[in-house]
Interface confidence: low
């Protein structure tokens, strides 16, 4: 059985294809190749005569075809027009003809694709975006990549138009990409340059920094406002509801207690039309917003009951503070034997009794802050009672 085989079957444009012949009969006069599925003299490519070992170009010869003595046909520099069927007719010595038909497919070397978009500046949670991979070519597979990865499964991603169009439903700020499309055919593949989306969003609720609430008079107040937004938000400041300025930063030098109040940052995105505000309370006070931990000291920590007295002192470097004392979680003084002096910095117990043994600590505080000392332990001992008979033991 006479057969033909295309090597290769899928050919890149500009390359060559060899139509191989198998089971060629013996005792031949010659053979001819034709373009198409049947023998048609007008579509003869080349004929070969065994006796003269000479090939004769036919009407369909383009100058790119070479016939070999084994009847194989080489077609060089193929074009897409060469795609299709080729028929070999063998003329045997008994004048009986045999035919075999083969085919091959020529694919173009694919160009570098590009991505077009129906909306390059979509609004978050509102707009959809359709990407289209260009050009549209036949017999081409279209693939998409997001962040160099194949498409994730997502209800917001839709492929259509033979996978040539990728639609993002309800874009988010995380959908910036990059996006790439790849086109493939059996002989080549090519990927587009990456495309990124400029997703318009925000502003989110602004953040005012630093987070400090308390400031001392004479300090400089410097507040900065930031809200995630694309395009970047436009900012304005209000103090106690009164507009101050349209800047991202608010600076007030040498503040006084009169600068206390509510500070509002207003963020606006002119594209989305959205606004967000954040209010921060600022307190300007001489009081320390952070009271340091006080130190507690005892004149002695082990005393004799009903005999000794003890002085506990609470030390602090902070000014404008008050001091209070605690014993076993109870506020002091709790008896007439306990006295506070020197602005409550000293707690005196005179005399000390058994029930005074335990843990003491002090707390310093102002209207906006407080801090307590580490505890101190007071031990109360009693001397051994004298012998009732006055005699020494033994």
């Amino acid at each position: 059985q006479l057969t033909t085989e295309s090597m290769p079957f899928n050919v890149a444009e500009g390359k060559e294809v060899l139509l191989l012949v198998h089971n060629l009969p013996q005792q031949l006069f010659g053979y001819s190749w034709y373009k198409g599925e049947r023998v048609d003299g007008n579509r003869q490519i080349v004929g070969y005569a065994i006796g003269t070992q000479q090939a004769t170009p036919g009407p369909a010869n383009s100058g790119r075809e070479t016939i070999y003595p084994n009847a194989s046909l080489l077609i060089q520099n193929v074009t897409q027009n060469d795609t299709g069927f080729y028929t070999l007719q063998v003329i045997k010595s008994d004048l009986v003809n045999e035919e075999a038909t083969g085919q091959f497919h020529v694919y173009p070397e694919l160009p570098k694709p590009s991505i077009s978009s129906n909306n390059s500046n979509p609004v978050e949670d509102k707009d959809a975006v359709a990407f289209t991979c260009e050009p549209e070519t036949q017999d081409t597979t279209y693939l998409w990549w997001i962040n160099n990865q194949s498409l994730p499964v997502s209800p917001r991603l839709q492929l259509s138009n033979g996978n040539r169009t990728l639609t993002l439903l309800s874009v988010t700020r995380n959908d910036t990409g990059p996006y790439e499309c790849e086109i493939q055919n059996p002989v080549s593949a090519n990927r587009s340059d990456p495309v990124t989306l400029n997703v318009t969003y925000g502003p989110d609720t602004p953040t005012i920094s630093p987070s400090d609430t308390y400031y001392r008079p004479g300090a400089n107040l410097s507040l900065s406002c930031y809200a995630a937004s694309n395009p970047p938000a436009q900012y304005s400041w209000l103090i106690n509801g009164t507009f101050q300025q349209s800047t991202q930063e608010l600076f007030i030098p040498n503040i006084t207690v009169n600068n206390s109040g509510s500070y509002t940052c207003h963020a606006n995105n002119s594209v989305t039309g959205c606004n967000r505000t954040t209010v921060k309370t600022i307190i300007v006070t001489e009081l320390s917003p952070v009271v340091a931990k006080p130190q507690i000291k005892a004149s002695k920590t082990t005393v004799t009951g009903d005999k000794d007295s003890v002085n506990l002192t609470c030390s602090t470097n902070d000014t404008g503070i008050s001091i209070r004392w605690f014993f076993k979680n109870q506020s002091l003084p709790s008896s007439e034997r306990m006295k506070l002096s020197q602005g409550n910095t000293t707690l005196s117990i005179n005399p000390v009794k058994r029930e005074d043994a335990g843990t003491y600590w002090c707390e310093v505080f102002n209207p906006i802050s407080k801090n307590q000392s580490d505890p101190i332990m007071l031990n109360v001992n009693y001397n051994a009672l004298p012998q009732e008979n006055g005699l020494s033991p033994g």
């Epitope: 444009e13 500009g14 390359k15 070479t66 070999y68 074009t79 897409q80 027009n81 173009p108 070397e109």
Partner: antibody
């Protein structure tokens, strides 16, 4: 790696013949055509023609028919250029060059200087 | 036959400067079926065989530095060396492989100024 190694320099008298060889290695010899290019002293490049290494079929450029013969010995992956009836104007460096898949000559032999002098 | 004409015949360029060589073909070498220009550029240094630099008029051969670039279409083509190096001193040839006989330009000698 692909290499085309040509035979050494030749000195001939007018009327004599010379045969230059070009041995290929590093690829399938019969898959790529081989061209011959001439470069006369101080002159440019002149394409002489090529030989189909699959069929052995040579193609000669105008001016290189008759005295010039391209041939092959595929068993040793070698192409030959034979010039007969040498003339003084045949003095030149002769290059073999592989016809790349796209057509241009992607690999060249080192060249063979043929000097024709009485 | 297609005649290839290069200009200039020689040029001297300072190191680091741009060198531009032109090549004109007497017939169109653009193949409309694949939109390829069947034109190549070669570099030949003294005592060496030519080396393929560019094919399809603008595609750099593997391993060729990117300071070499080709452009043009149809009948007018250009080889540009964007930043001339000392090792670029050579004769440069264009060649059409659109139709037989394949033909070369006469060559352009590039020297250091």
């Amino acid at each position: 790696q692909v290499q085309l190694v040509q035979s050494g320099s030749e000195l001939r008298t007018p009327g004599a013949s010379v045969k230059v060889s070009c041995k290929a290695s590093g690829y399938t010899f019969t898959s790529y055509g081989l061209s011959w290019v001439r470069q006369a002293p101080g002159q440019g490049l002149e394409w002489m023609g090529w030989i189909n290494t699959n069929t052995g079929n040579p193609t000669y450029a105008q001016g290189f028919t008759g005295r010039f013969v391209f041939s092959l010995d595929t068993s040793v992956s070698t192409a030959y250029l034979q010039i007969s009836s040498l003339k003084a104007e045949d003095t030149a460096v002769y290059y073999c060059a592989r016809k790349g898949i796209w057509g241009p000559f992607d690999y060249w032999g080192q060249g063979t200087l043929v000097t024709v002098s009485s | 036959d297609i005649v290839m004409t290069q200009s200039p015949d020689s040029l001297a360029v300072s190191l680091g400067e741009r060198a531009t060589i032109n090549c004109k073909s007497s017939q169109n070498v653009l193949y409309s079926s694949n939109n390829k220009n069947y034109l190549a550029w070669y570099q030949q240094k003294p005592g060496q065989p030519p080396k393929l630099l560019i094919y399809w008029a603008s595609t750099r051969e593997s391993g060729v530095p990117d300071r070499f670039s080709g452009s043009g279409s149809g009948t007018d083509f250009t080889l540009t060396i964007s930043c001339l190096q000392a090792e670029d001193v050579a004769v440069y040839y264009c060649q059409q492989y659109f139709s037989s006989p394949w033909t070369f330009g006469q060559g352009t000698k590039v020297e250091i100024k």
